[in-house]
């Protein structure tokens, strides 16, 4: 007997062909011999089966001796053997209907688990293989699990169900809720305005939740909440903000924070958390601020950086268009009795300048000027 696989909620067409290429009488029945549909002349007639309102045929094919049974909005319990009676002969088709669903929501937080559950008819023994958007293959039986979802797992998962050497393909769209970057670092000269941006890696029609930015200043012994905010339908409203520093926040996505000026006491690391409505867990993004200051006090020219810098970063002091006078993997460098001219303080990583501050050293009889 012929085997046809169907997908829950989909439409399937079971074929039945007569040797005569003309419209003749036919009937479709299920395994309990209950009539599903047939014809009476040109009319489609339906029997008392549970498929009544979901069964159909394709009238234009009857004249060609084809009498299909079309079942719409398939259910798992439609799995059965269907019998077509035409010209004193019987054609049997076994229909197996499968369903594949995600455990809860298809919108999951980064780090959470995805479970796909296969619904299958009694007596079937299907195997399932799923391919993630980044090409990772997972295999299983009735359930498949993927732990620790990553941003690259967002997209269409393609799952193939195999039964009786036949296959049916499911596509499930998964959205991993996360920030575009897990961590970012901002380098600023003292006194400059600081912009922090927290773009999301997903788009949804309505986004509601609440968030907070905790800040651990390098100079402070404990962390402190700098700002708390609400998010309602992609509109941002500030709930509470510290007086020092007085952060400003954009009213629209992406989440955007402005620190009026970079000061050494603000240098450090922050953690922005976002709790989304109807989701357990939170989204996190780390943000780091490195502040540079160049000063001349009497006969000492000093360059300092505050904040989380990696040990491989190089801090240098050099006179413009000259070789570096001092270059160290430290957070402060200085030059005694600097000669007059425009000095540059550079923070660099493998030759790439991350931060630069200029200071003009005047001849010894005058005071320094900071441009």
């Amino acid at each position: 007997k012929k085997v046809v696989l169907g997908k829950k909620g989909d439409t399937v067409e079971l074929t039945c062909t007569a040797s005569q290429k003309k419209s003749i009488q036919f009937h479709w029945k299920n395994s309990n011999q209950i009539k599903i549909l047939g014809n009476q002349g040109s009319f489609l007639t339906k029997g008392p089966s549970k498929l009544n309102d979901r069964a159909d045929s394709r009238r234009s094919l009857w004249d060609q001796g084809n009498f299909p049974l079309i079942i719409k909005n398939l259910k798992i319990e439609d799995s059965d053997t269907y019998i077509c009676e035409v010209e004193d002969q019987k054609e049997e088709v076994q229909l197996l209907v499968f369903g594949l669903t995600a455990n809860s929501d298809t919108h999951l937080l980064q780090g959470q688990s995805l479970t796909l559950t296969l619904e299958s008819p009694p007596g079937s023994s299907p195997s399932v293989q799923c391919r993630s958007p980044r090409g990772k293959n997972i295999q299983g039986g009735k359930t498949l699990s993927v732990s620790q979802l990553e941003l690259q797992d967002s997209g269409t998962w393609t799952c193939t169900v195999l039964q009786n050497q036949k296959k049916v393909e499911f596509k499930i769209d998964i959205v991993v809720l996360a920030f575009q970057k897990a961590s970012s670092i901002v380098y600023k000269k003292e006194g400059e305005q600081v912009e922090f941006s927290f773009p999301l890696a997903f788009t949804v029609e309505k986004l509601t939740g609440s968030g907070e930015l905790w800040w651990q200043a390098e100079r402070a012994s404990s962390s402190k909440s700098w700002i708390t905010f609400d998010l309602k339908n992609k509109e941002v409203s500030v709930k509470r903000v510290t007086q020092d520093p007085k952060l400003q926040m954009g009213k629209k996505l992406p989440l955007h924070l402005t620190l009026p000026q970079a000061l050494p006491q603000y240098a450090g690391s922050g953690n922005l958390t976002l709790a989304l409505e109807a989701k357990t867990g939170k989204l996190h993004q780390e943000v780091n601020l490195v502040v540079m200051r160049a000063t001349q006090l009497q006969k000492n020219l000093t360059c300092e950086v505050w904040g989380p810098t990696s040990p491989k970063l190089m801090l240098s002091l050099k006179l413009e268009n000259k070789e570096a006078k001092v270059s160290k993997r430290e957070k402060a460098v200085w030059v005694l009795n600097p000669e007059a001219g425009m000095w540059q303080c550079l923070l660099s990583d493998s030759g790439q300048v991350l931060l630069e501050s200029n200071i003009k050293v005047l001849p010894t009889w005058s005071t320094p000027v900071q441009p």
Partner: antibody, heavy 117, light 107 residues
């Protein structure tokens, strides 16, 4: 949701061929027939033919037999209608439509094909 | 081929009017008939199938009746968005054929 998106407008010379595409989304492509219907400017609807993407079977209106070919690419869920030996009276909007057993629902947005020398 | 003839080819009506369009088949097509609505520059939209079944999402002011060779589409109370061209279509045999259309215009 179920959607059919067709290729853009074409201008063709008499005697040449045109191939219009129809990309399906939001449903299992192989489970539904695709039909092609055309509409000349200011005129009514004219059925051209059908295809079952699952079996590859096709059927064409007698009027277009030999000039029309309907094909499908399952991997991209796209149906194609190629009309050859074009003449000026083939200037029309060509629609693809999903078969909703016996009926057409939904339809593509239409593709204007202009045949002019 | 089965010929489908619609009448009238055009009609003028006002908002709130009851409008009736007829479609006649050249041979018995039992109830294998559908009605479509088409607005200028847009694709047709299925309104009624199996002669009298209302397609999901279509307002209940649209109704279809008839069997055999004579069919009717009725709009019980014409709304501004109903001004369009209406087509009938038979599905009893290939080639599938449409009526010539009925244009419903504002009086």
């Amino acid at each position: 949701q179920v959607q059919l998106v067709q290729s853009g407008a074409e201008v063709k010379k008499p005697g040449s061929s045109v191939k219009v595409s129809c990309k399906a989304s939001g449903y299992t492509f192989t489970n539904y027939y695709i039909h092609w219907v055309r509409q000349a400017p200011g005129q009514g609807l004219e059925w051209m033919g059908w295809m079952n993407p699952n079996s590859g079977n096709t059927g064409y209106a007698q009027k277009f037999q030999g000039r029309v070919t309907i094909t499908a690419d399952e991997s991209t869920s796209t149906a194609y209608m190629e009309l050859s030996s074009l003449r000026s009276e083939d200037t029309a909007v060509y629609y693809c439509a999903r078969d909703w057993p016996n009926w057409f629902d939904p339809w593509g947005q239409g593709t204007l094909v202009t045949v002019s020398s | 081929d089965i010929q489908m003839t619609q009448s009238p080819s055009s009609l003028s009506a006002s908002v709130g009017d009851r409008v009736t369009i007829t479609c006649r088949a050249s041979q018995d097509i039992s109830n294998w008939l559908a009605w479509y609505q088409q607005k200028p520059g847009k694709a047709p939209k299925l309104l009624i199938y199996d002669a009298s079944s209302l397609q999901s999402g279509v307002p209940s002011r649209f109704s279809g009746s008839g069997s055999g060779t004579d069919f009717t589409l009725t709009i019980s109370s014409l709304q501004p968005e109903d001004f369009a061209t209406y087509y009938c279509q038979q599905a009893i045999s290939f080639p599938l054929t449409f009526g010539g259309g009925t244009k419903v215009e504002i009086k």
